[in-house]
């Protein structure tokens, strides 16, 4: 039975040219995380495999940095980066958990961040 929940940074905004941290946190389960995938719509940005570490998709290697933790840092943001991002946690023995983040990249310098949480 899957008892876990994914907490995410929710809806966030950032300024064009800046950077943003996408962060998810799996809680309320003792399941072991074997792999985390980060996806933008249907495109894979990166994976973090528990055994083999971070692998950044070649298409994004210049603008994506691993971490902090199992999160992902997007750099040199453009308005085209606006959209949905998904963290997909492959766990053992629970199975798969998915979290959603919506990022809006603003031209303005008045980008307001949504609610953030601290990961212990």
């Amino acid at each position: 039975m899957m008892t876990g929940t994914i907490e995410t940074t929710g809806n966030i905004s950032a300024e064009k040219g800046g950077s943003i941290i996408l962060q998810c946190h799996l809680s309320s389960t003792t399941a072991q995380v074997t792999q985390v995938n980060w996806e933008q719509q249907d495109q894979l940005l990166a994976i973090c495999n528990a055994d083999l570490g971070w692998h950044i998709s070649p298409s994004f290697k210049d603008r994506v940095a691993p971490g902090p933790g199992l999160g992902l840092t997007l750099q040199s943001l453009t308005v085209n980066d606006t959209g949905e991002y998904f963290c997909i946690y492959h766990t053992y023995p629970d199975g798969t958990y998915t979290g959603r983040i919506f990022l809006e990249v603003l031209e303005s310098s008045v980008a307001e961040h949504g609610a953030r949480f601290q990961i212990p």
């Epitope: 074997t34 792999q35 055994d51 083999l52 570490g53 692998h55 998709s57 070649p58 053992y92 023995p93």
Partner: antibody, heavy 125, light 106 residues
Framework: QVQLVQSGAEVKKPGASVKVSCKAS????????ISWVRQAPGQGLEWMGW????????NYAQKLQGRVTMTTDTSTSTAYMELRSLRSDDTAVYYC??????????????????WGQGTMVTVSS | EIVMTQSPATLSVSPGERATLSCRAS??????LAWYQQKPGQAPRLLIY???TRATGIPARFSGSGSGTEFTLTISSLQSEDFAVYYC????????FGGGTKVEIK
């Protein structure tokens, strides 16, 4: 076509080391993990560990920790497995195997679609 | 470590008959299970991955089913080239193989 070609058979004395190579061709080497699997005569398959050809990170089976080292040379698309302090029960055919899924598929890694032909390692005094 | 147990150890079947091979995981592996065929002197060959998806070039007479801890490989009508040893393998948490089932001619 996609293939893995391994080095030839080896005969070693107990306590020695062996290094087996596995040359990949026909695909983008750095997009996949390589596992090493061994099979003692008349026995089943035993996973030894794996290595990411993308970042060189490794994970080894617990029983071989401290005796095995896996490396890659991306310039020649070759993976290597070195086993030290050889014992008679290390006598086996050693296979390299490529993951079915590339890192960019997003699939859970660990099923193997391409295998080397195998390298027989005999440990005998 | 997840232990994979295959049964039976040996299965005697006549050509043209159906063969059913079982694989049990000591803990749930979801659908992270593969089946391999190995003939003497050859490397293993991937038949099924994701518990039920046939690998490229594998004939339709091979099918896989199951999820969690119980899995089955079915060969609907055995051909002469199907007599071999079959291994299941989980990759939900590291990697472990079952002990194998030898399918021999009855």
């Amino acid at each position: 076509q996609v293939q893995l070609v391994q080095s030839g058979a080896e005969v070693k004395k107990p306590g020695a080391s062996v290094k087996v190579s596995c040359k990949a061709s026909g695909y983008t080497f750095t997009s996949y993990a390589i596992s090493w699997v061994r099979q003692a005569p008349g026995q089943g398959l035993e996973w030894m560990g794996w290595i990411s050809a993308y970042n060189g990170n490794t994970n080894y089976a617990q029983k071989l920790q401290g005796r095995v080292t896996m490396t890659t040379d991306t310039s020649t698309s070759t993976a290597y497995m070195e086993l030290r302090s050889l014992r008679s029960d290390d006598t086996a055919v050693y296979y390299c195997a490529r993951d079915l899924s590339s890192f960019w598929s997003g699939d859970v890694l660990g099923a193997f679609d391409i295998w080397g032909q195998g390298t027989m390692v005999t440990v005998s005094s | 470590e997840i232990v994979m147990t295959q049964s039976p150890a040996t299965l005697s079947v006549s050509p043209g008959e159906r063969a059913t091979l079982s694989c049990r995981a000591s803990q749930s592996v979801s659908s992270n299970l593969a089946w391999y065929q190995q003939k003497p002197g050859q490397a293993p060959r991937l038949l099924i991955y994701g518990a039920s998806t046939r690998a490229t070039g594998i004939p339709a007479r091979f099918s896989g089913s199951g999820s969690g801890t119980e899995f089955t490989l079915t060969i609907s009508s055995l051909q002469s080239e199907d007599f071999a040893v079959y291994y299941c393998q989980q990759h939900a948490n590291h990697i472990t193989f079952g002990g194998g089932t030898k399918v021999e001619i009855k």
